[in-house]
Amino acid sequence: MACLGFQRHKAQLNLATRTWPCTLLFFLLFIPVFCKAMHVAQPAVVLASSRGIASFVCEYASPGKATEVRVTVLRQADSQVTEVCAATYMMGNELTFLDDSICTGTSSGNQVNLTIQGLRAMDTGLYICKVELMYPPPYYLGIGNGTQIYVIDPEPCPDSDFLLWILAAVSSGLFFYSFLLTAVSLSKMLKKRSPLTTGVYVKMPPTEPECEKQFQPYFIPIN
C-alpha cells in the first residue's frame, strides 16, 4: 500500500487551511496503520515583508507520541542544503531558538509557527521545514517539500538622523538666503534714499471742496 501522506503541497493555501483539521485528524488516526513515516506540510510560497521578515506554518502528522521534538529550517539552493536555524522543544513547552538565531517560533500541538528575520533579496530560496521526533524511541524524520520565500529589497531609505541633517541644512540655507536677500534689498533702497537729500514745502492747491480752507503739505525731493 502506498504511503498516504501530504504529497507536494500545491493546493491553494486557503483551501489547505480549511481542510487541515480533518486531514490532521485522519492522519493521526490512520498513519500508524498505513505508514511508518512522518509527513510535514508547509506553504508553497511566502513573500517576505519589506522589513525582511517571513513567516510560515510547519505542520506535521506524528506517527508516534513524541515528548521531544526538534525543528530545523534548511535552505536549499542549487542542490546545496544549509541549516538556517534549529530548535528542540518539549511537547507543551515553547519553542526556543538560540539567542543569535535569525529564527523565532511558537509551537502549538503538531504545528510550529516559524518566523525568519533579517532576510535580503539574496536570501530568496527554498526553505525546508525538517521535523524530528527525538524522544522517546523510535526516532522519526519528517521533511517538508519546502516554502519558496521571495525577498525583495526595499528602495534604500535614509535613516532619520540623516533626514534631520538634510532638513537642518536646507532650513539654514533658506534662512541665510532670505537674510541675504533682505540685506541686499535694504542696501539698494538705502542707496536710493540718501540721508543728505534736501527739499521744500510748498502750498498745494486744495484737493477738498472750496469750503475747506486747509492746505495739504507735500514733500518734493530736490536732486
Partner: antibody, heavy 118, light 108 residues
C-alpha cells in the same frame, strides 16, 4: 575538507571491551547526527547506533542494546563507541557516518576492523 | 522494523548496458526517506541517491532513482567499468535505520 577518521579497532577476546573513536573535521560537528554502521566480513551493512546533536538523545540497534554506548565530545569533534561484552558476531568493519541535513548518510569514514576471537 | 529486500542478488552485465536494481520494503516508505549507496571492495559505502530520486553531490547523471510506497528502483543507464560494485538501498525515515542485503553488479 569534510572527513571522518575511525580508530581503535583490533583483536579482542569475547566478553572483553573496546572503544572506537571517530575524529571529524571540515564541518560544524554539533549540527549533525552521527551514526555507527558495521559490516561483517562478506555481509551487508548493519546500522548500530546514532547520537544526536548535543548528545542527549541516542538510539541503538536491538542487537547491541545494553552492551554498546555511543557518545560524542563536541568540543573535540569526536564520536565514540564503547563496546562491552563483545561477542564473535560483533566481528565487523565499523564505520562512522554523518547523517545529511536531509537524513541520508552522506559522509563515511574509512572504517576500522574489530575482530572478536578467542 | 522496516525490512528492505533487494533483487536480484547478483546482476551480470557488460559495460555500456543498462542496469536496473530493485528494492522492496516490507511496509510503505515515504520516497523522501530512501537512499541508494555504492560500495566497492575494501572501501566505505558512497551515497548515490537520496530522497528516492535526488542525486548526491558529484554523482554522474547515468545514475537515477525512482519509485514510491514499497517499490524503488536504481537505474544505471550505461554501465561504466567503475560502476561494477555492490549497491545497497536504505530507509532513514524512522529508527532503526535499515539497509537492503545488497545487489552485486558484476562484469559478464
Amino acid at each position: 575538507q569534510v572527513q571522518l577518521v575511525e580508530s581503535g579497532g583490533g583483536v579482542v577476546q569475547p566478553g572483553r571491551s573496546l572503544r572506537l573513536s571517530c575524529a571529524a573535521s571540515g564541518f560544524t560537528f554539533s549540527s549533525y547526527g552521527l551514526h555507527w554502521v558495521r559490516q561483517a566480513p562478506g555481509k551487508g551493512l548493519e546500522w548500530v547506533a546514532v547520537i544526536w546533536y548535543d548528545g542527549s538523545n541516542k538510539h541503538y540497534a536491538d542487537s547491541v542494546k545494553g552492551r554498546f554506548t555511543i557518545s560524542r565530545d563536541n568540543a573535540k569533534n569526536t564520536l565514540y563507541l564503547q563496546m562491552n561484552s563483545l561477542r564473535a558476531e560483533d566481528t565487523a568493519v565499523y564505520y562512522c557516518a554523518r547523517g545529511a541535513l536531509l537524513g541520508a548518510f552522506e559522509i563515511w569514514g574509512q572504517g576500522t576492523m574489530v575482530t572478536v576471537s578467542s | 522494523e522496516i525490512v528492505l529486500t533487494q533483487s536480484p542478488g547478483t546482476l551480470s552485465l557488460s559495460p555500456g548496458e543498462r542496469a536496473t536494481l530493485s528494492c522492496r520494503a516490507s511496509q510503505s516508505v515515504s520516497s523522501s526517506y530512501l537512499a541508494w549507496y555504492q560500495q566497492k571492495p575494501g572501501q566505505a559505502p558512497r551515497l548515490l541517491i537520496y530522497g528516492a530520486s535526488s542525486r548526491a553531490t558529484g554523482i554522474p547523471d547515468r545514475f537515477s532513482g525512482s519509485g514510491s510506497g514499497t517499490d524503488f528502483t536504481l537505474t544505471i543507464s550505461r554501465l561504466e567499468p567503475e560502476d561494477f560494485a555492490v549497491y545497497y538501498c536504505q530507509q532513514y525515515g524512522s529508527s532503526p535505520w535499515t539497509f537492503g542485503q545488497g545487489t552485486k553488479v558484476e562484469i559478464k
